[in-house]
């Protein structure tokens, strides 16, 4: 039950996170005109990854896309790439995790396959979240660097325009949305990975019985082995003291090398 809850919660948190990453990527307010201690203008400038906008005091807003690809700064291109990679990985992760959900039955899919898929989606969410956080952080660093630079006739770093008036840019809402969304996706991914550890396959219908061969301390199991998932627990027989048969239900589990990805 706890595993299902952890998996479900991880999925929901990741879903919200990826929706946030998509929203942040599409938002125009990655950087906004700094209004503090600046010449007060009757227009408000703000910029996104794809276009820059100007809002006049009347409320009239005009946005212009960055129609050049080669003319854009490498850093902006890198941020775009990171955000898109984050979205793609997140979307694939969501698709995979839907099929991996314990509460959803698809044909005769084994728990081992679900565990595999849960881990895969978890890793995808983690990478997706890291991509978003990295993208937003790179952009924020770019803003901080430009903020302190002399801005008279300076290259704004956005859309290849020359700055003719001292306009400084500060963090826009999209940066905060991106950081939070990236963090949520990361947390969701971690939860999926944790859930994967608890997704042990269902027991076989018959009991595996241990037999003592005379003069040997080795227990022999005729069939009925658990299929190794690569993600679940390794099975190791308990030492048998009473010479009687023990069921696999009593077998202790030990962490495998796959548990710590």
């Amino acid at each position: 039950m706890a595993v299902t809850a952890c998996q479900g919660l991880g999925f929901v948190v990741s879903l919200i996170g990826i929706a946030g990453i998509i929203a942040a990527t599409c938002m125009d307010q990655w950087s906004t005109q700094d209004l503090y201690n600046n010449p007060v203008t009757a227009v408000f400038n703000y910029q996104g990854l794809w276009r820059s906008c100007v809002r006049e005091s009347s409320g009239f807003t005009e946005c212009r896309g960055y129609f050049t690809l080669l003319g854009l700064p490498a850093m902006l291109q890198a941020v775009r790439a990171l955000m898109i990679v984050g979205i793609v990985l997140g979307a694939i992760g969501l698709l995979v995790s839907i099929f991996a959900l314990k509460c959803i039955r698809i044909g005769s899919m084994e728990d081992s396959a679900k565990a595999n898929m849960t881990l895969t989606s978890g890793i995808m969410f983690i990478v997706s979240g890291l991509c978003a956080i990295a993208g937003v952080s790179v952009f924020a660093n770019m803003l901080v660097t430009n903020f302190w630079m002399s801005t008279a006739n300076m290259y704004t770093g956005m859309g290849g325009m020359v700055q003719t008036v001292q306009t400084r840019y500060t963090f826009g809402a999209a940066l905060f949305v991106g950081w939070v969304a990236g963090g949520l996706t990361l947390i969701g991914g971690v939860m999926m990975c944790i859930a994967c550890r608890g997704l042990a396959p269902e027991e076989t219908n018959y009991k595996a019985v241990s037999y003592h061969a005379s003069g040997h301390s080795v227990a022999y199991k005729p069939g009925g082995f658990k299929a190794s998932t690569g993600f679940g627990s390794n099975t190791k027989n308990k030492k048998i003291y009473d010479g009687g048969a023990r069921t696999e239900d009593e077998v202790q589990s030990y962490p495998s090398k796959h548990d710590y990805v």
């Epitope: 010449p39 007060v40 203008t41 009757a42 227009v43 400038n45 910029q47 820059s52 906008c53 100007v54 006049e56 005091s57 009347s58 409320g59 009239f60 005009e62 212009r64 704004t156 325009m161 020359v162 700055q163 003719t164 008036v165 306009t167």
Partner: antibody
Framework: QVQLKQSGAELVRPGASVSLSCKTS????????IHWVKQRSGQGLEWIGR????????YYNENFEGKATLTADRSSSTAYMQLSSLKSDDSAVYFC?????????????WGQGTSVTVSS | DIVMTQSPSSLTVTTGEKVTLSCKSS????????????LTWYQQKSGQPPELLIY???TRESGVPDRFTGSGSGTDFTLTVSSVQAEDLAVYYC?????????FGGGTKLEIK
Amino acid sequence: QVQLKQSGAELVRPGASVSLSCKTSGYIFTSYWIHWVKQRSGQGLEWIGRFYPGTGTAYYNENFEGKATLTADRSSSTAYMQLSSLKSDDSAVYFCTREGYGKGNAMDYWGQGTSVTVSS
Amino acid sequence: DIVMTQSPSSLTVTTGEKVTLSCKSSQSLLNAGNQKNYLTWYQQKSGQPPELLIYWASTRESGVPDRFTGSGSGTDFTLTVSSVQAEDLAVYYCQNDYYFPFTFGGGTKLEIK
């Protein structure tokens, strides 16, 4: 059509206050900035400030801070400017104007002006 | 405050003549975000309130005759009247529409011979 009708001429004593009105019609009053401009006899134009009736936000030219107070009555779509502690150099024609939408903050409609004479 | 300087202060021309009015600002009125200049031209005829002629330095207000043309960028702007008519007798003001407080030039009085 858009119209801005200003109140009649005022003759006031030095040190007194006066309130000028600007009744608007033909557009949504709360969606546009109202500006006030001063023009002394035979001289140029001086921007006093602007007021947004939708939110009650006002911006003033520092030279008129404490001199002019901009307000509005949304129910009657009327903007007001109160001038206090009047002196002789406050004698001028005062215009109310509307800031256009998508016109680079330009003032596209003007009232006919109100003449204020400060004299003892 | 931004200082707007207009020249000449007055100008006498004959009808049909081409006339150029100049306006200079102490700071650039070009906004990098949309590459637009926030400069406006007004025409004020005697005893009347000013009328909007040109905004964004070069966009004609609807109803304004096409003989009026605005040009320039940054700090230097011009208003050109391609063929002056008798009804163009007025004072022309340029205005900074970018920085607060908005400021007007001293005006150029256009007179007809």
